[in-house]
Structures are given as C-alpha cells and as structure tokens.
Amino acid sequence: STPSKKSWAYLQVSKHLNNTKLSWNEDGTIHGLIYQDGNLIVQFPGLYFIVCQLQFLVQCSNHSVDLTLQLLINSKIKKQTLVTVCESGVQSKNIYQNLSQFLLHYLQVNSTISVRVDNFQYVDTNTFPLDNVLSVFLYSSSD
Amino acid sequence: STPSKKSWAYLQVSKHLNNTKLSWNEDGTIHGLIYQDGNLIVQFPGLYFIVCQLQFLVQCSNHSVDLTLQLLINSKIKKQTLVTVCESGVQSKNIYQNLSQFLLHYLQVNSTISVRVDNFQYVDTNTFPLDNVLSVFLYSSSD
Amino acid sequence: STPSKKSWAYLQVSKHLNNTKLSWNEDGTIHGLIYQDGNLIVQFPGLYFIVCQLQFLVQCSNHSVDLTLQLLINSKIKKQTLVTVCESGVQSKNIYQNLSQFLLHYLQVNSTISVRVDNFQYVDTNTFPLDNVLSVFLYSSSD
C-alpha cells in the first residue's frame, strides 16, 4: 500500500484588493489544487485542514470597528472570526490587529475554498505583503 | 513504498528571556530536528508546518504598545504578526494578549527556524511558563 | 509497510453552555476517537495536533474582562490563552473577541482531551453557532 496522497497550498493575498472576496497571488506554493478567481479548487477528495491569517490596520475614529474573516466552502460560510477594535472610541494612531481562522473539512473534487472580509480596506497589504495568507493541506485522502 | 518520514518539535520558551531572538527549553519534544542557539535546524528536506504562539502581559501606561511575533527562516523575516494593545491610553491593570503565527514552507537540510519578538520583556513567562511555544512538523518529505 | 493510521475530530460547541468545562455537539466529524461528557477519548496512541478556537461576545461595563481558553489533557491544564477585553473601561456596545489555542502532544490510549473557559457565559453560541470548535488529528501513530 502507498503512503497518503499529498495536496497543499500556501497563497499570499493580492497587493490590490477591491472586493470582499479576497484574491490571491497565483505565484504561491500550490500542489494538487488549482487556483482560479479567488477560489482554491480541490482535485482530490479527502479531509483538508484549511487555515487563513490576515493582518489588519485601522485608523481609529470615534467609533469601534468590527473586523471579520470568513472561510467559505462552495461559497457558503463555514467558519468566521469577528474581533472588535478601536473599542475605546479614542481617535488614535494606527491600530494593528491580526485574525486567523481554521477549518477541518471533508471536500469533494471541484469543491471551492475562498475567503471573505467585510472591511477589506483594512487588510494591510502595504506593511505586510507576505503576511496575509491562505493555506490548505490534505490530511487524509479518501482514495 | 514506505509511509512519509516524520519530524516534529514542540518547544516551550525559556523562563528567562534576555533577547529579541527567543530561546527555548531544550527538554521539549523534538524528533528529526536539532535545537541550537535559539534555532531549530532541519535534518530532512521537505514541506514544514511551523506555528508559534506567545502569551503577553503589558502594564499599560499612557501610550499604546505594538506587540510583534516574527517567524524567521535562515534569519530572514518570513511571516509576522503585529497587534496594538493599550490603545485607549488609560493607565490600567495588566493587559493580557495572545499572538500566534504560522507558516507552511519548504525547507532544505540545515535550514534554521527562529522567532523574534521586539518587546521580549512583555512575553509572559511567569504566569504562563508552558504557554509560549514553537511547534514544527514535517508535512511532506522530499526524499 | 502501511501508511500512518488516521484519527481526527472536528466538533462544534453545544448551543447551551452551563459549565466551565465545555460540551460539544456529538454530530460533529469524528474518526478514531470517542466523545463522551465533554471529553475526546483517544483510541490510538501517538502524537496529536489539537486546536481549539472560540468566539466571544462581551457587553463591556466599567471594568476590563479577562477571557480564557484552556486545553486539558487528562483533566490537567496543558496550555492556555488569556486575553483582556474592555480595557478602556468604557461602557460600550458589544465587543467581539476570538481566542485560539493549539497543542502538539503525545497521547496514550484512553487519554482525554477537554476545554475549559472561565467565563463560559461570554462564549458566543448565538451569533456563531458553528464557529466555536475543537479539532484534533493524529500526526504520527506509535504502532
């Protein structure tokens, strides 16, 4: 019998975001999956570990801000993070925050994995071009 | 054919930190890697999952504090987290914060993995001696 | 020789929490472990990767709140996260926060994995019924 099939991806966010659905640099590490239009597309069925981490930068005004990070499978929200910043209502210098989210999920062939962020303008692609990432690896294949 | 080679580490931070480059207790769990001078040194080439989590304790004064956590490969900044605490500028009791960072990276033999924290004096080794950790495991070996 | 044994779990928190020891929905994904009374019980010895992520919602009053997340092995605290919210002391709208914690640990047969949260009333099971999870997978089996 052969060892488990291996599939993985490690993608960094695009420098210029203009949508709540994040897009990713295609020159990232990718093996056994396909990247297309903001989606990672599964080629081998199995149990996948999915993890996303984003760095945010918010210029606080006089109200708090809720930062979100959502993992979607086949365009359906499967897991989300919500963190409030600027809670004091003090107009201050830049506030940095970091959100992460993981998922262990069984995926069929052609399933899509994507990430949504409500306030995408706060994702810090300037200071941290390498630090906003979506990563996936196949834990257990089903064939 | 044989199953994948396994390499892993789970190290807890040294009790007494005195440098921005963190040092780790050598009595941690380690298999297929070597620990030396704050570095984990790779013995088998392959795709590694690296994750670090640190617990911070800050006594807020009248200004905000930026906490950092950086993963370095061969001493190069590969991934970093930055989180602002004490944002309200209120002198208050202790503020606890937790930062984590992960990386999926292909590493050659003798590659080094290390962690840098600019304000290392805030890493809470007293309350949480077991909770500041660097962990690594080989996902896919290349031989 | 055969490929590594696979064991995993991905459980979502119960809708109605009434204890510092969290309980989990039994209809989650579980393979090679048993769930009973808030515990995941190991069936195969080996090195396990354990990760828990919880979403909190706090209505700030005039004092700060320390949120905790503790991973326990055989009812013993092995790793914990502590994060302070409502630090400004401003009575405000809802504050969202997200905590995560991981552990790489060697477990024997019948070892138990559980999660404890001091202020369990702040775990947000209403807004985020799917987003409070405990996940485990066997990295390397010892037989």
Epitope: - | N18, N19, K21, D37, D66, T68, K76, D118 | -
Partner: antibody
C-alpha cells in the same frame, strides 16, 4: 551583490539635529532588520538600535533612547537615522549594518558616515 | 549589559606566525559570539559567526573557538593584509555589545 550606501559626512553645530541615510541594494529590503552602530574616534563599536523595514517598528539600546530616531522609506529601500540635541560626545562614525543571521551578526556594512559636532 | 573584554590591546607578530585573539564575556553566552576585522578607514567585516562558523569569502586561515565565557579568534599564518583591529560581539543577550578591540601589528 549586497550594498549599503550611506550619505556623506556632516558638520553640525551643538544642539542641532542631523539625519543620515542608508540606501540598500542587492537584496529584498524588507527581509532583514536594519541596524545602526556608532564608533567614536579610536573607540569600540556601540549598537544604537534596529528597525523592521516592513512596519517601521524600531528597537533602541537604552543608551540611545531620545538621542536617535530610526525610520525607513520602503519605496526607496532607504533607512534613516536622526540624531538630535547634538553634543561633542555624538561626534563619531555611524554605520548602518544588515544582519547575517537576522539578529546581530552583521555581514553587510555601509561605508560609514562621519558626524562632527563643532561650534 | 554583557561586558566583553578583549586582550591584549595590541598584538605584534611576524608574517607567517600563528596569532590568537582573546575575548572574555562577563557572563556565559553559549556560542553566540561573532568576530570582525576592521582595517584602517574601513568598515567592519564579519569573519566568524557563532563562535566557530566560517563565513563564505573569508580566508580559511581564520578560525574561532570557545563557548561559555572564553572565546578565541585565531589566524594560523598571518599575512600583511591582516593588519587591522579585531572586535568580538555577543548576540546572546540584548542589547548586543562589542569588545574593546585588539590591534594587530606586523613586526
């Protein structure tokens, strides 16, 4: 080839400020911290501080807090050090240095900038 | 801060001789010591890192040894181009510090 090109010598009056630059080339500027080191005439080397070129967060040797301010301009791969309230004690050669090991083994050095404080 | 003491202040040797520079730390620093050469009017140049690890492009006649508090930089056959000041630096404890230097002269 890695190069750190520093600005030219400065003659400044006591109490004034000076800002010296260090332009990096031959590597990705944001990959490594930039360090600054002081060498007084005929004396040893003293580490002033370092700066993360990604977000501009600086760490200072306590001795130089309030004296030196480190900044970066990512777009031009240039690091800066401003020295304020200058006295004769600040007369020295100042080096920028990029680390070999990401911390404090400095493989790459600028040619040095001589700052002379004199009335 | 960790104090690094270099001795002697001046070393005078003939070409072809072996020479050793000493660096002593005020407390144990493992092997986190680095050695530099600085020629007249030049910038420092990294010779050895972490006590004994060689640097590419540095002649093989340079070597380092020691751990804990006592460290040595050796040149096994001195050449005239080696006339310079030599500094040790510790990176075990923040802030990083340098020794006072040893001047190498040729007889």
């Amino acid at each position: 080839e890695v190069q750190l090109q520093q600005s030219g010598p400065e003659l400044v009056k006591p109490g004034a400020s000076v800002k010296i630059s260090c332009k990096a080339s031959g590597y990705t500027f944001t990959d490594y911290y930039m360090n600054w080191v002081k060498q007084s005439h005929g004396k040893t080397l003293e580490w002033i501080g370092d700066i993360n070129p990604n977000h501009g967060g600086a760490t200072y040797n306590q001795k130089f807090k309030g004296k030196a301010t480190l900044t970066v301009d990512k777009s031009s791969s240039t690091a800066y050090m401003e020295l304020r309230s200058l006295t004769s004690e600040d007369s020295a050669v100042y080096y920028c240095a990029s680390p070999y090991d990401g911390y404090y083994g400095f493989a790459y050095w600028g040619q040095g900038t001589l700052v002379t404080v004199s009335a | 801060d960790i104090l690094l003491t270099q001795s002697p202040a001046i070393l005078s040797v003939s070409p072809g001789e072996r020479v050793s520079f000493s660096c002593r730390a005020s407390q144990s620093i493992g092997t986190s010591i680095h050695w530099y050469q600085q020629r007249t009017n030049g910038s420092p140049r990294l010779l050895i890192k972490y006590g004994s690890e060689s640097i590419s492009g540095i002649p093989s006649r340079f070597s380092g040894s020691g751990s804990g508090t006592d460290f040595t930089l050796s040149i096994n056959s001195v050449e005239s181009e080696d006339i310079a000041d030599y500094y040790c630096q510790q990176s075990n404890s923040w802030p990083t510090t340098f020794g006072g230097g040893t001047k190498l002269e040729i007889k």
